[in-house]
């Protein structure tokens, strides 16, 4: 089995985690994709997912999580805005491929959010940013209930994360405020 590796990201409260999960576009472009948290001793829990089938570049928002699936590029972008200390944890991108188990998309991300002034750029950001607005209109998708505790046997393709301090124009609810509804028949 392939060893699961982690990337650690230390951010401040109020900042944004920006993760880019690469996938083989020919295989997975329209597949439903999800962002999961893995808590110690528990199965992965789906926090947000794209629509089924996934729509190209169409943002899906669940609380403070925003997913954008770029079919043309084979890239799923996940943002967690206005980070809170309690968001700290282990996360992963997966692709749903029923009836098979979800396919993990990258090295897992170990997110550590600490208290502190976030008015300055985070450790992975510089002054490159010029405009960053949270989209005012997004879709909330229904996510499958099932998760998989299995060890991934194929080499996991790819992701990365980037941080920023967004100029958010809307109030976002907590990521815990989600309803998990099965969508597979």
């Amino acid at each position: 089995a392939t060893k699961l590796t982690e990337e650690k990201y230390e951010l401040k409260e109020g900042q944004t985690l920006d993760v880019k999960c690469d996938y083989t576009l020919e295989k997975f472009a329209s597949s439903q994709k999800a962002w999961q948290i893995i808590r110690d001793g528990e199965m992965p829990k789906t926090l947000a997912c794209t629509e089924r089938p996934s729509k190209n570049s169409h943002p899906v928002q669940v609380g403070r999580i925003i997913l954008e699936d770029y079919h043309d590029h084979g890239l799923l972008r996940v943002r967690m805005v206005n980070l809170q200390v309690e968001d700290s944890g282990l996360y992963q991108c997966v692709i749903y491929q029923p009836p098979k188990e979800p396919h993990m998309l990258f090295d897992r991300i170990r997110l550590v959010v600490t208290k502190g002034f976030s008015g300055t750029p985070g450790s992975n950001e510089n002054s490159t940013q010029n405009v960053y607005k949270i989209p005012p209109t997004t879709t909330k998708a229904l996510c499958p209930l099932y998760t998989s505790p299995r060890t991934v046997t194929q080499a996991p393709p790819k992701s990365t994360a980037d941080v920023s301090t967004p100029d958010s124009e809307i109030n976002l609810t907590n990521v815990t405020d989600i309803i998990r509804v099965p969508v597979f028949n």
Partner: antibody, heavy 116, light 107 residues
Framework: EVQLVESGGGLVQPGGSLRLSCAAS????????MSWVRQAPGKGLDWMAS????????YYVDSVKGRFTISRDNAKNSLHLQMNSLRAEDTAVYYC?????????WGQGALVTVSS | EIVMTQSPATLSVSPGERATLSCRAS??????LAWYQQKSGQAPRLLIY???IRATGIPARVSGSGSGTEFTFTISSLQSEDFAVYYC?????????LGGGTKVEIK
């Protein structure tokens, strides 16, 4: 087939301005991030700027921030780069690129020469 | 800013041989790394993304590997059309940065 055609290059004096345009076809322009990448004569590639499909995110490399402005017109499938306060070191071939993080498709480039 | 360093600057290889190029990042870029090919007088072309995923239409003799800070790009058996300059690029953080390139020339 994806096509990106740059225009607007040419010779300009230091301190002058130039506006590059890129006509895009063969893909859904309004669903794609777009970028500008440049290449000085005999040198490597340098990313300049990227813009999200709806304009809600724009990023620049520090060396052009405040001088260059990326913009787009989704109705006309066009991308632009307004370049002000040009310097000799801005002399390069400027490529219009589909993609905001990595660069999926490239135009053939527009040569910008800054010289007195 | 993440600095990308490619080596060697020039690689002399005979047709049919294997070419192995290296790219090192000054800090971890996870697997968010792309490779491009640029032939003389032409625009670059995306070959690999996600460190190891081949872009559409790229032949199987081209491959990429690595994660974190060390990456490798390999052409298993060089063909005449493979002699070009190759660039790596990270897209983990802004600003997006590219390596200085490796020129693969005919030995």
């Amino acid at each position: 087939e994806v096509q990106l055609v740059e225009s607007g290059g040419g010779l300009v004096q230091p301190g002058g301005s130039l506006r590059l345009s890129c006509a895009a076809s063969g893909f859904t322009f309004s669903s794609n991030w777009m970028s500008w990448v440049r290449q000085a004569p005999g040198k490597g590639l340098d990313w300049m700027a990227s813009m999200k499909q709806d304009g809600s995110e724009i990023y620049y490399v520090d060396s052009v921030k405040g001088r260059f402005t990326i913009s787009r017109d989704n109705a006309k499938n066009s991308l632009h780069l307004q370049m002000n306060s040009l310097r000799a070191e801005d002399t390069a071939v400027y490529y219009c690129v589909r993609g905001g993080w990595r660069f999926e498709s490239w135009g053939q480039g527009a040569l910008v020469t800054v010289s007195s | 800013e993440i600095v990308m360093t490619q080596s060697p600057a020039t690689l002399s290889v005979s047709p049919g041989e294997r070419a192995t190029l290296s790219c090192r990042a000054s800090q971890s870029v996870s697997s968010n790394l792309a490779w491009y090919q640029q032939k003389s007088g032409q625009a670059p072309r995306l070959l690999i993304y996600g460190a190891s995923i081949r872009a559409t239409g790229i032949p199987a003799r081209v491959s990429g590997s690595g994660s974190g800070t060390e990456f490798t790009f390999t052409i298993s058996s060089l063909q005449s059309e493979d002699f070009a300059v190759y660039y790596c690029q990270q897209y983990k953080n802004w600003p997006l940065t590219l390596g200085g390139g490796t020129k693969v020339e005919i030995k």
